[in-house]
Interface confidence: low
């Protein structure tokens, strides 16, 4: 005389944040009254109570106050449970246990799901790509559930399976962020597609990236520039070296040479149609016209300014083309520091004095070091400020606060990190009077 309890065979699929109904029904006999009904919903595995109806009354939710029965339908045998604001943690099996005179139970599965976002694609490296370069394409899709299936394919729809690494990470809500990384060697050009599939929702989210390297795989012009930055003093002239290897029979009529700022692509200087097109950069640039035919595409930059600092691209086109970027690092030496003392008279051991070390018109920002007469570094109570003027040159002011001993020497060293140039000043305080050492 067991009671027949019916639930759906297939799992109930519910989206995170929505409400789900776990259907459960029984067949009440004639004359059945709710006073006879004991209904218990529990988690199948742990037997944790979820919701119950007993002694003719809804006993309420024992599950985070997110469950409800359908009280008006109970008498007709509808024991279904409403679960509100579904979370990933709700996934699993729920048992519907019905007891009247006889009893019966059945379990229904809740499958939680969340759609994945449209994937975002990133490329590393993402510029100056050449056929033959190894690139890393990352496909990222967020806040889905359950774990995704990720597929990569090329522009012809051919699956790419080698050198793919996919990681999936759950957040506090249990939703997954998926990151899939494909490493490929570029051909002449190519499209790479990433498809993120939610296996429960059968929802596919795709994105693709098309990479067109800058040139064909063969016959590129090899452009050579120095690896290290070119260091130039403010106000002097700098040569940004760039060279290429001209083939036999090369003539300047074939040459297109463009110097531009790497970041902004602003034109700096060009040589096209067999002639020097001149400076497009404040009339402070020049080529070496007599050396061009031998493959010397270097650029002379006159009266260097702080604002010139940065990367310059040398772009050479004959039949094929190539380019390379050279960095210009601007520098200016710092002046010999001047030292001032506050207060500067009637000094006694135990007095607190403020020693200011000032050095002017340097670039880039300085490193400042203080030490005492024994060469011991002084780091406490030092405040250093650096202020750029309209030319971008820095004035540095470093303030040391010390308590005087019987006497003492305090040295300040202002270092230009690019020029590795050190400028020093020092002050010797001998109780009373105080002396500055003579200028070196």
């Amino acid at each position: 005389g067991a009671l027949e309890v019916q639930v759906p065979e297939d799992p109930v699929v519910a989206l995170v944040g929505t409400d789900a109904t776990l259907c459960c029904s029984f067949s009440p006999e004639p004359g059945f009254s709710l006073a006879q009904l004991n209904l218990i919903w529990q988690l199948t595995d742990t037997k944790q109570l979820v919701h119950s109806f007993a002694e003719g009354q809804d006993q309420g939710s024992a599950y985070a106050n997110r469950t409800a029965l359908f009280p008006d339908l109970l008498a007709q045998g509808n024991a279904s449970l409403r679960l509100q604001r579904v979370r990933v943690a709700d996934e699993g099996s729920f048992t519907c246990f019905v007891s009247i005179r006889d009893f019966g139970s059945a379990a229904v599965s809740l499958q939680v799901a969340a759609p994945y976002s449209k994937p975002s694609m990133t490329l590393e490296p993402n510029k100056d790509l050449r056929p033959g370069d190894t690139v890393t394409i990352t496909c990222s899709s967020y806040q889905g559930y359950p774990e995704a299936e990720v597929f990569w394919q090329d522009g012809q729809g051919v699956p790419l399976t080698g050198n793919v690494t996919t990681s999936q990470m759950a957040n506090e809500q249990g939703l997954f962020d998926v990151h899939s990384i494909l490493r490929v060697v570029l051909g002449a050009n190519g499209t790479y597609s990433c498809l993120v599939r939610n296996p429960v929702l059968q929802q596919d989210a795709h994105s693709s990236v098309t990479i067109t390297p800058q040139r064909s795989p063969t016959g590129a012009v090899e452009v050579q520039v120095p690896e290290d930055p070119v260091v130039a003093l403010v106000g002097t002239d700098a040569t940004l070296r760039c060279s290429f290897s001209p083939e036999p029979g090369f003539s300047l009529a074939q040459l297109n040479l463009i110097w531009q700022l790497t970041d902004t692509k602003q034109l700096v200087h060009s040589f096209t149609e067999g002639r020097d097109q001149g400076s497009a950069y404040a009339n402070r640039t020049a080529l070496f016209p007599d050396l061009l035919a031998q493959g010397n595409a270097s650029l002379r930059l006159q009266r260097v300014r702080v604002a010139d600092e940065g990367s310059f691209t040398c772009f050479v086109s004959i039949r094929d083309f190539g380019s390379a970027a050279v960095s210009l690092q601007v520098a200016a030496p710092y002046s010999k520091p001047s030292m001032t003392l506050e207060p500067n008279k009637d000094l006694r051991p135990g007095d607190t004095v403020t020693i200011t070390c000032s050095s002017y018109r340097g670039y880039p920002e300085a490193e400042v070091f203080w030490q005492d007469g024994q060469g011991v570094p002084l780091t406490g109570n030092v405040t250093t400020s650096q202020m750029a003027n309209e030319q971008g040159l820095f004035d540095v002011h470093s303030v040391l606060r010390v308590v005087l001993g019987a006497n003492g020497t305090y040295s300040c060293l202002v270092r230009n990190p690019v020029l590795q140039q050190d400028a020093h000043g020092s002050v010797t305080i001998t109780g009373q009077p105080m002396t500055f050492p003579p200028e070196a």
């Epitope: 490296p125 033959g132 190894t134 890393t136 690494t165 060697v185």
Partner: antibody, heavy 117, light 112 residues
Framework: EVQVVESGPELVKPGASVKMSCKTS????????LSWVKQRTGQGLEWIGE????????HYNGKFKGKATLTADKSSNTAFMHFSSLTSEDSAVYFC??????????WGQGSTLTVSS | DIVMTQPPLSLPVTLGDLASISCRSS???????????LHWYLQKPGQSPKLLIY???NRFSGVPDRFSGSGSGTDFTLKISRVEAEDLGVYFC?????????FGGGTKLELK
Amino acid sequence: EVQVVESGPELVKPGASVKMSCKTSAYTFSDSVLSWVKQRTGQGLEWIGEIYPRGNVTHYNGKFKGKATLTADKSSNTAFMHFSSLTSEDSAVYFCARWNNFFFDYWGQGSTLTVSS
Amino acid sequence: DIVMTQPPLSLPVTLGDLASISCRSSQSLVHSNGITYLHWYLQKPGQSPKLLIYKVSNRFSGVPDRFSGSGSGTDFTLKISRVEAEDLGVYFCSQSTHFPWTFGGGTKLELK
């Protein structure tokens, strides 16, 4: 200037494991690939595997799968190689080298591993 | 895996001579994109390897022009036009066309 510096020499017993480090400077660590290469005394070079720190992506030479585990710490610009179940065959100099799309352009000085009871 | 063979193990030379070091691969090193990823490294005693030539014939920055590389398919040669004392050491060829990357056994350039 790009620098690649490995950890110091190691003397370990057979069956033990060891973790070598490789600290780099003067380039964007996350966006480069670091490889490990093995060289037994008086012998050739064997590529072990590589790590791409941005996504902790690793690729291994099949011969070293299960033997070597590569990891990276982006905050310290350091790559690590964990070598397990050591035998005398693992005694070698291990180099860390930066992979520059086609080739290894900067190499560390090498770290000597001696496995001996 | 691709096997890189470098005969002979040792190549005795006189300073100022032309030295020629060969390398053969068990399969063509021409990638499907048309590029051949064959490189040469020099390892001096007690040092790490240093890149000399990449993609068959391209000199790496700072490498003197007395070094030149040539070859195609499976057969490659590194030439040193006038050997200097600082060129002595072990020369390795290496391929990065086929995964995993592999190296030759090395050829030791030493004085006669």
